[in-house]
Amino acid sequence: IWELKKDVYVVELDWYPDAPGEMVVLTCDTPEEDGITWTLDQSSEVLGSGKTLTIQVKEFGDAGQYTCHKGGEVLSHSLLLLHKKEDGIWSTDILKDQKEPKNKTFLRCEAKNYSGRFTCWWLTTISTDLTFSVKSSRGSSDPQGVTCGAATLSAERVRGDNKEYEYSVECQEDSACPAAEESLPIEVMVDAVHKLKYENYTSSFFIRDIIKPDPPKNLQLKPLKNSRQVEVSWEYPDTWSTPHSYFSLTFCVQVQGKSKREKKDRVFTDKTSATVICRKNASISVRAQDRYYSSSWSEWASVPCS
Amino acid sequence: RNLPVATPDPGMFPCLHHSQNLLRAVSNMLQKARQTLEFYPCTSEEIDHEDITKDKTSTVEACLPLELTKNESCLNSRETSFITNGSCLASRKTSFMMALCLSSIYEDLKMYQVEFKTMNAKLLMDPKRQIFLDQNMLAVIDELMQALNFNSETVPQKSSLEEPDFYKTKIKLCILLHAFRIRAVTIDRVMSYLNAS
């Protein structure tokens, strides 16, 4: 058993049918010695008396808020949560496996630049009685500071019969140098509590590996005289690291017809302009990627050809 | 994805082309190592990230763009000094810092070159003959060093009398390649920045 926060305790259980469970001793936080009784949750049934209460925790029915009283007055509370270990592996019931970029990916994180700011998000089908708390650091043995905000519900989607809820959190490394070469990964730890179930999820990454630039901005077309060709121009996104001559991007320009089946023409360039043939009803899209370290491409920025 | 090959303009900063070739070569070599050594811990998540140049050179600090010198987090150590007479500086009014930066890059390349050559000698003794260093990568390191053209004492190639542990050597190869790829990215960024200024 360990303390998650004041008066909230996590009992770790080897989870299998007929498991013996864990013996837990609760102590009433009071100078009083006599006339103390214990109850669980809203029940008035007295579970025991005395300054300590010994219980055998086996299932969720044994978890909850234990309260010690004296003469009708509440003295203190202890909330017991369960953390299930199923055949040597901690349970992952609360969050959905996003399966991208690989199986067992519960937390996904992205950064728009090298400033040390990043966003992580996760999915669940649970709508109520759910809380998250997020901690982060650079490295684990001698951790350096990363400050995370509160996790917030950022999207709701309907997936078949189920509703899916997306939560996200923003974090910022306390002293980040955009040009630094990372040797210790960022660690992100999410504590999830659903009713009386506790779970924790972790992700470990280098900022360089989670970079995904914003789409190029100010995408414009300039028709070339006496030609079907157009000059496409764009700019680096505002959120990208500066100076741009050091943090350079490379770009992919795509001409896509109205029908998805039509052949796509693609051009790769390091410049912020390109000459392409604009077909009728086609659209021109441009996306960006770090020129020197192949992390994710940005989403497309698009303009119609007409 | 192959990086687009830039054809250098005649007036172009001479080292940019070499640094782009270097990044391409080390990226290809790392990809080859990850595929060949699939049963070894060779991915970014599995290896220890070690920097053989740590405390010996200070490339990131010495080559910091002016715009980032206002960022206190980037200024932990900028006291290293090196010899300054490189040909990449040709026909340019370079500051002392730029010379310091390029000589730091040269020292990096020299240290990695020694490590890679020592390692290749061990890998050639492996009866499995599983993996060797790409000669193209070694040649590209050499080309960039020549373009930088700094006078520096030659570092003797390390020789080891004991029987090599090939498992450990291959893991060390992965560690070295990951670190060198990260340094090659920094070198490319620096060359791009210097070319633009």
Partner: antibody
Framework: QVQLVQSGGGVVQPGRSLRLSCAAS????????MHWVRQAPGKGLEWVAF????????YYADSVKGRFTISRDNSKNTLYLQMKSLRAEDTAVYYC????????WGQGTMVTVSS | SYVLTQPPSVSGTPGQRVTISCSGG????????VKWYQQLPGTAPKLLIY???IRPSGVPDRFSGSKSGTSASLAITGVQAEDEADYYC????????????FGTGTKVTVLG
Amino acid sequence: QVQLVQSGGGVVQPGRSLRLSCAASGFTFSSYGMHWVRQAPGKGLEWVAFIRYDGSNKYYADSVKGRFTISRDNSKNTLYLQMKSLRAEDTAVYYCKTHGSHDNWGQGTMVTVSS
Amino acid sequence: SYVLTQPPSVSGTPGQRVTISCSGGRSNIGSNTVKWYQQLPGTAPKLLIYGNDIRPSGVPDRFSGSKSGTSASLAITGVQAEDEADYYCQSYDRGTHPALLFGTGTKVTVLG
């Protein structure tokens, strides 16, 4: 004590369907994940499928994906394996088992796919 | 397809020490715990070892398990006639959990 009693096995022609049941008693069935494992005559153990305690997630071996469906009825304390488009290579003893460090197995039920 | 490899058979005379190996990889045994099962003819498998080296109550102490890196092994010290059976190791793969990965199985024969 924990008990898993299996039923539903038998002889079936290729292409036909069969449903296996596994009745649980002696524990809170709705709190635990469950597996199906099979063993072809004279061969080793092969995992078939898994279902979470609440039925929210199901996992299948590639060899049965799209043909077999694992399900559970927590109100009846019963686990099911619906097998469709059966093939000769599905012939095996099928076992249900609890998920956990200490596990309990059903007695096994023989499924023979033969024309 | 089995990714945990066991020897097809091992044998020993009563009282001898018999060991069965189970060889896997970094993503299975290297990352997860190992179980061992004993299966007597015509019966369901019986758990002998869980968590690499823990014996459930009721399992004789002549059975012991160990794990090192990407391999595990089961030892029977002082093998007895009633130990003649098939033995299977089992683990998980970190990418496909909770799918059970079983070893190929080993037939233990007690001679004489």
